[in-house]
């Protein structure tokens, strides 16, 4: 590439840059443990931490668990990406009555329009079916005087949605204002539309929240409460508690009304990559044999491998990094030749063996 030589020369002697023949440009070399956000990084901001699978890098640069859509009434809308959470929505035929961050805390079946009513707007994952009278200006046959009451101005009658609660509440009851519960009425009975200013027999006016006990009239002492396995975050949103279901995690503190469950590595393991309220990667305490050094990054994925340490050095069996912080997360696809964390202190002589890392491929 003689025509590229002037450009290539600008990279020589600068260890923080390299010349990419494919793009014919000088590129910034991301530091260890960070990965490029573009093919030819130009500056440090083009390099980011990469989280473990099923974690994403949030706005605060923390590895945060992606929400799971494992409940029967949820489906994945968008997948877990390196910089955004998985997003779940109610499965077809249902709508969300209680939203949660990147998910839905409570889904209900779409209403079936009763006799004399037709669908005006079909139900979606976010909204219930909206019904209207079959013939404009003609009221449906009234089974009782109460059923003939006109809805308040600007609202459209709807059949009552059927709740599918992810946890404790019985499917035949619904939380209603004031904390009491009513038996679900027959589907043919009409209630006001969800955004009607006053309506009995629908979820609490605060989406996703219901009082923990009936509130005395005029009392402001009603604590809002989310669905099971969700907690009320600082912003007043129902947020999914992290799960400790991975084999290498144990529950440290339970999911509470106002705080997430917290997980920690099970006994005999330490956290190599921290995550919000959990640990993204647990590794066994290093067991260092003479003249070998454990590669912690590979432990969770395959048999332990050992490498000869550089000449004149002793294996570092200290389970925590020198600065006391967990090392930056590295790619879930692992390093090619030298583990990016181990290599912070273990540059390998050219003659030393190096291993292409692979997960059972």
């Amino acid at each position: 590439f003689p025509q590229d030589r002037p450009f290539e020369d600008t990279c020589h002697g600068n260890p923080s840059h390299y010349y990419d023949k494919a793009v014919r440009r000088c590129c910034y070399r991301c530091p260890m443990g960070l990965f490029p956000t573009q093919q030819c990084p130009q500056r440090p901001t083009d390099c980011r931490k990469q989280c473990e699978p099923d974690y994403y890098l949030d706005e605060a640069d923390r590895c945060t668990a992606c929400v799971t859509c494992s409940r029967d009434d949820l489906v994945e809308k968008t997948p877990c990406a390196w910089n955004s959470s998985r997003v779940c929505e109610c499965r077809p035929g249902m709508f969300c009555s209680t939203s949660a961050v990147n998910s839905c805390a409570r889904c209900f079946f779409h209403s079936v329009c009763p006799a004399g009513m037709i669908v005006k707007f079909p139900g979606t994952a976010q909204k219930n079916t909206v019904c209207e009278p079959a013939s404009p200006g003609v009221s449906p046959a009234c089974a009782s005087p109460e059923n003939c009451k006109e809805p308040s101005s600007g609202t459209i009658p709807q059949a009552k949605p059927t709740p599918v609660s992810p946890a404790t509440s019985s499917a035949s009851t619904m939380p209603v204002r004031g904390g009491t519960r009513l038996a679900q009425e027959a589907a043919s009975k009409l209630t006001r539309a969800p955004d009607s200013p006053s309506s009995v027999g629908r979820p609490s006016s605060d989406p996703g929240l219901s009082p923990t006990q009936p509130c005395p009239e005029g009392s402001g002492d009603c604590r809002k409460q989310c669905e099971p396995d969700y907690y009320l975050d600082e912003a007043g949103r129902c947020t999914a508690c992290v799960s400790c279901s991975r084999d290498d995690l144990v529950e440290k503190t339970p999911c509470a009304w106002n705080s997430s469950r917290t997980c920690e590595c099970r006994p005999g393991m330490i956290c190599a990559t921290s995550a919000t309220n959990s640990c993204a990667r647990c590794v066994p305490y290093p067991i260092c044999a003479a003249e070998t050094v454990t590669k912690p990054q590979d432990m969770a994925e395959k048999d332990t491998t050992f490498e000869a340490p550089p000449l004149g050095t002793q294996p570092d069996c200290n389970p925590t990094p020198e600065n006391g912080e967990a090392p930056a997360s590295t790619s879930p696809t692992q390093s090619l030749l030298v583990d990016s964390q181990a290599s912070k202190t273990l540059p390998i002589p050219t003659s030393a063996p190096v291993a292409l890392s692979s997960t059972g491929k």
Partner: nanobody, 123 residues
């Protein structure tokens, strides 16, 4: 000093096969992607194939799909390119490259390069 050394090139008849090797040595950090490029005489550099070394995911240029196979041998720190049903248009210098997978994409950086090995397909 990082070294990527290609071998296995040579003269082969159309329809024949060759297996290229790329031996990696030295200190390559954070790398999780290796690939092959080629440059035909008087032409620009063309991407051929790459492998994401942790997941084993492989990718190929349309021009070689179904004929070339990329693989890796962890124990020997070696990348391979098995080339079958070779054509005259496959004649080129083949380069090995190593780098990192770009976040949120399926492309890679190319931070380290070999010197290349010549493949000539001719009758």
């Amino acid at each position: 000093e990082v070294q990527l050394v290609e071998s296995g090139g040579g003269l082969v008849q159309p329809g024949g096969s060759l297996r290229l090797s790329c031996a990696a040595s030295g200190y390559i950090y954070s790398s999780n992607c290796m690939g092959w490029f080629r440059q035909a005489p008087g032409k620009g550099l063309e991407w051929v194939s790459r492998i994401h070394t942790g997941s084993g995911s492989t990718y190929y240029a349309d021009s070689v799909k179904g004929r070339f196979t990329i693989s890796q041998d962890n124990s020997k720190n070696t990348l391979y390119l098995q080339m079958n049903s070779l054509r005259a248009e496959d004649t080129a210098v083949y380069y090995c490259a190593a780098g990192r997978v770009v976040l949120g994409a399926v492309v890679c950086t190319n931070e380290y390069w070999g010197q290349g090995t010549l493949v000539t397909v001719s009758s």
